[in-house]
């Protein structure tokens, strides 16, 4: 029978670490991490790490009992967890019977938004207490709410990942800019900034009709030339506060009275701010 892995949590040092080993298995040949999605009961989905590793093809894998994988996550707070993956059979060949290296994977470490993860793996038996053992490590940075997979997570939806404010902005005269945008039921307070290398105008927008989508309009006084300036719309939603996804548009000249407003070149542009 071909070896498979059975993985379980092991937060402390492996018991083999306390034993003296004449020889230890070789290091891993490759270690990779990629995110995968799994559905959860709430109708949402969770993002997990698919950690895969490749064993070196030589006789040292005959000593191999397990591979231990530890993940450290750094964001607002630090997390640390480890799993030990035991091999169910002794290795009878250095490569898979069908060809190629022995490759295994573990899916289980949860992935939070916008977090840098350090994933380390080593084979067991590992090095003796005062020796450096072979190990491999990789970094993995999880995406934020603008990611095409993440944006459908409930946390991201509540932060406005699916909201398109369809910002339009035009220079009415030298002193004012008119900004129009579609509101969202997610919140009722917004901040509109006009930037042309520096901030030349801003306005708080309070939209009392929170429960339905409406088209809001605000006229903002400016202190400089506004044509070609950037409009930045910052929403304030309960779930993300002042750290919600921001949207951008560009100021153009207002059309003459009776001429339709030019929407085409003022599409909302996602900014780089993530919850």
């Amino acid at each position: 029978r071909e070896p498979t892995v059975q993985c379980g949590s092991e937060t402390g040092p492996s018991p083999e670490w306390m034993l003296q080993h004449d020889l230890i298995p070789g290091d891993l040949r490759d270690l990779r991490v990629e995110p995968v999605t799994t559905s959860v009961a709430t109708g949402d989905y969770s993002i997990l790490m698919n950690v895969s590793w490749v064993l070196r093809a030589d006789a040292s894998i005959r000593l191999l009992k397990a591979t231990k994988i530890c993940v450290t996550g750094k964001s607002n707070f630090q997390s640390y967890s480890c799993v030990r993956c035991n091999y169910t059979e002794a290795f009878q060949t250095q490569t898979r019977p069908s060809g190629g290296k022995w490759t295994f994977s573990y899916i289980g470490f949860p992935v939070e938004l916008n977090t840098v993860y350090f994933i380390g793996a080593h084979n067991i038996p590992n090095a003796n207490m005062n020796e450096d053992g072979p190990s491999m490590s990789v970094n993995f940075t999880s995406p934020g709410c603008l990611d095409h997979i993440m944006k459908y997570k409930k946390k991201c939806v509540k932060a406005g990942s699916l909201w398109d404010p369809n910002i339009t902005a035009c220079k009415k005269n030298e002193e004012t800019v008119e900004v129009n945008f579609t509101t969202t039921p997610l919140g009722n307070r917004y901040m509109a900034l006009i930037q042309h290398s520096t901030i030349i105008g801003f306005s708080q927008v309070f939209e009392p009709h929170q429960k339905k989508q409406t088209r809001a309009s605000v006229v903002i006084p400016v202190t400089g030339d506004s044509e070609g300036a950037t409009v930045q719309l910052t929403p304030y939603f309960p779930t993300c506060g002042s750290d919600c996804i921001r949207h951008k548009g560009t100021v153009v000249l207002c059309p003459q009275t009776g001429v339709p407003f030019p929407l085409d070149n003022n599409k909302s542009k996602p900014g780089g701010w993530l919850p």
């Epitope: 030589d58 006789a59 060809g99």
Partner: antibody
């Protein structure tokens, strides 16, 4: 029946290169590493390197690392060993040898005599 | 690299004799050792692997033993076709090395 059939004898001048082929049959080519071993006249056996036909991973004996190139063509189940900058002490019989479950050499080619002489 | 020391380098024996060849390694190779037989002008032939397992079609008069750093090839009753050179080889991870060989000659 597993067979490894090597190309014929070669005579080369110092500084030249030689490429030896090893055509295999009777087993799944990508499932076993292929090793190359040489034997100088009246001498012992010397491992040169190995290639995994599945993904072309190669491991060399440091002694030959700068001069030997191992390749393979999976479409014709053939492995190749090229040795460059030949010297007179490279005169030897060169063998391809297929690994077993681990790197014992279960099957050998018949050998290719490479003579380096000016 | 792991060094392989084979002894004796040559020996003379008669048909029917029991012959023993030893191979010592510079470090523990956990029985990852093979033995080969080579006749003049021919490729080597696998006799034993994993120190004790017979290769395909190898007569049972050949046997292997040992562990750690010391290994032995034994031919229980030498036959005429056994006069050849014998090599040990470790396969405990590259680079693989061979013993210097033992030539078994007719007494």
């Amino acid at each position: 029946e597993v067979q490894l059939v090597q190309s014929g004898a070669e005579v080369k001048k110092p500084g030249a290169s030689v490429k030896v082929s090893c055509k295999t049959s009777g087993y799944t080519f990508i499932s076993y590493w292929m090793n190359w071993v040489r034997q100088a006249p009246g001498q012992g056996l010397e491992w040169m390197g190995r290639i995994d036909p599945y993904d072309s991973e190669i491991q060399y004996n440091q002694k030959f690392k700068d001069r030997v190139t191992l390749t393979r063509d999976t479409s014709i189940s053939t492995a190749y060993m090229e040795l460059s900058r030949l010297r007179s002490d490279d005169t030897a019989v060169y063998y391809c040898a297929r690994s077993g479950g681990f790197d014992w050499f279960a099957y050998w080619g018949q050998g290719t005599l490479v003579t380096v002489s000016s | 690299d792991i060094q392989m020391t084979q002894s004796p380098s040559s020996l003379s024996a008669s048909v029917g004799d029991r012959v023993t060849i030893t191979c010592r390694t510079s470090e523990n190779i956990y029985s990852n050792l093979a033995w080969y037989q080579q006749k003049p002008g021919k490729a080597p032939k696998l006799l034993l692997y994993d120190a004790t397992n017979l290769g395909d079609g190898v007569p049972s008069r050949f046997s292997g033993s040992g562990s750690g750093t010391d290994y032995t090839l034994t031919i229980s009753s030498l036959q005429p076709e056994d006069f050849a050179t014998y090599y040990c080889q470790h396969f405990w991870g590259p680079p693989y090395t061979f013993g210097g060989g033992t030539k078994v000659e007719i007494k």
